[in-house]
């Protein structure tokens, strides 16, 4: 396994619809044919995966049908979208990439984007 | 020039499987996606799973998970798609397509299951 | 899943003929892609990214639209136009075709 460097916003603020955007950049040692990127959410310690997409050549990553997020690739950079955000879900996101293919394997782990959540106020009732 | 030569046609029996070869040339065979989609007569499109021939990972259809097996060769640039427990809803032309655009398709595969 | 449902499922029409086939999405998604498969065929990839047209295919053929509205529209219909036409979504597992359109001489 060999070190990459991944490059990553440090703080996002969502939008009032709960969608928070944001790009992975990786520097590639080589021409990977194969790329597996995942994003972690890390909060009090504890880590967990948000969601992942393995992509080749195409410029839209597929994810799994209850996935939050959805992205497209170019060149060496993941653009990344998160939906459904709620003011709990207010945390640390780290990209992470791997290059699968092929050989050797690389591995890199962004430091992470701050993701600012903020529940949109209700609506004042309003009299005509 | 691109092509995708797939297997000849299969009568199988219910409950027996069946494994279709798909054979790629013409381009780098680790860089594309190899896909499976069968079409039952008369019938539209079903995509059943998808394998990256360089790493081996595969994505499949939960429809069809338990039943589907895709493998890959890469010293011959031929992928496998075994299916098991086969019943008579499974007959179908069954084709392999490469990329995530679908952009080259093989001939397809006739398989039957009959008793 | 997501659903892909395109209206109509049968259209008449004839040469010359401006045709448009919607594809309506049951979940936003990212875009959509085309192809035309003519009996006893493999399909043939029309369109890609929504509105990418495919290596060789006419200027006639366009594709448009977002979230979960798309559309395939054909200009002036040329006789070789005739034939089913799929949509298709990637950007969730499983990957789903819409149940298509079959496109027939008026």
């Known amino acids: 396994c060999k070190a990459m460097h991944v490059a990553q916003p440090a703080v996002v603020l969502a939008s009032s619809r709960g969608i928070a955007s944001f790009v992975c950049e990786y520097a590639s040692p080589g021409k990977a044919t194969e790329v597996r990127v995942t994003v972690l959410r890390q909060a009090d310690s504890q880590v967990t995966e948000v969601c992942a997409a393995t992509y080749m050549m195409g410029n839209e990553l597929t994810f799994l049908d209850d996935s939050i997020c959805t992205g497209t690739s170019s060149g060496n950079q993941v653009n990344l979208t998160i939906q459904g955000l709620r003011a709990m879900d207010t945390g640390l996101y780290i990209c992470k990439v791997e290059l699968m293919y092929p050989p050797p394997y690389y591995l890199g782990i962004g430091n992470g984007t701050q993701i600012y959540v903020i529940d949109p106020e209700p609506c004042p009732d309003s009299d005509f | 020039q691109v092509q995708l030569v797939q297997s000849g046609a299969e009568v199988v029996k219910p409950g027996a499987s069946v494994k279709l070869s798909c054979k790629a040339s013409?381009?780098?065979?680790?860089?594309?996606?190899i896909n499976w989609v069968r079409q039952a007569p008369g019938q539209g499109l079903e995509w059943i799973g998808r394998?990256?021939?360089?790493?081996?990972?595969?994505y499949y259809n939960e429809m069809f998970t338990g039943r589907v097996t895709m493998t890959r060769d890469t010293s011959t640039s031929t992928v496998y798609m075994e299916l098991s427990s086969l019943r008579s809803e499974d007959t179908a032309v069954y084709y392999c397509a490469r990329g995530d655009y679908f952009d080259y398709w093989g001939q397809g595969t006739m398989v039957t299951v009959s008793s | 899943d997501i659903q892909l449902t395109q209206s109509p499922s049968f259209l008449s029409a004839s040469v010359g003929d401006r045709v448009t086939i919607t594809c309506s999405a049951s979940?936003?998604?990212?875009?959509i892609h085309w192809y035309q498969q003519k009996p006893g065929k493999a399909p043939k990839l029309l369109i890609y990214?929504?509105?990418t047209l495919a290596s060789g295919v006419p200027s006639r053929f366009s594709g448009s639209g977002s979230g979960t509205e798309f559309t395939l529209t054909i200009s002036s219909l040329q006789p070789e136009d005739f034939a089913t036409y799929y949509c298709?979504?990637?950007?969730?597992?499983?990957?789903?075709f819409g149940q298509g359109t079959k496109l027939e001489i008026k």
């Open positions: 013409g381009y780098t065979f680790t860089s594309y996606w």
């Open positions: 990214d929504t509105s």
């Open positions: 979940k936003s998604v990212s875009y």
């Open positions: 394998i990256a021939p360089g790493s081996g990972t595969t």
């Open positions: 298709q979504q990637r950007t969730t597992y499983p990957l789903t």
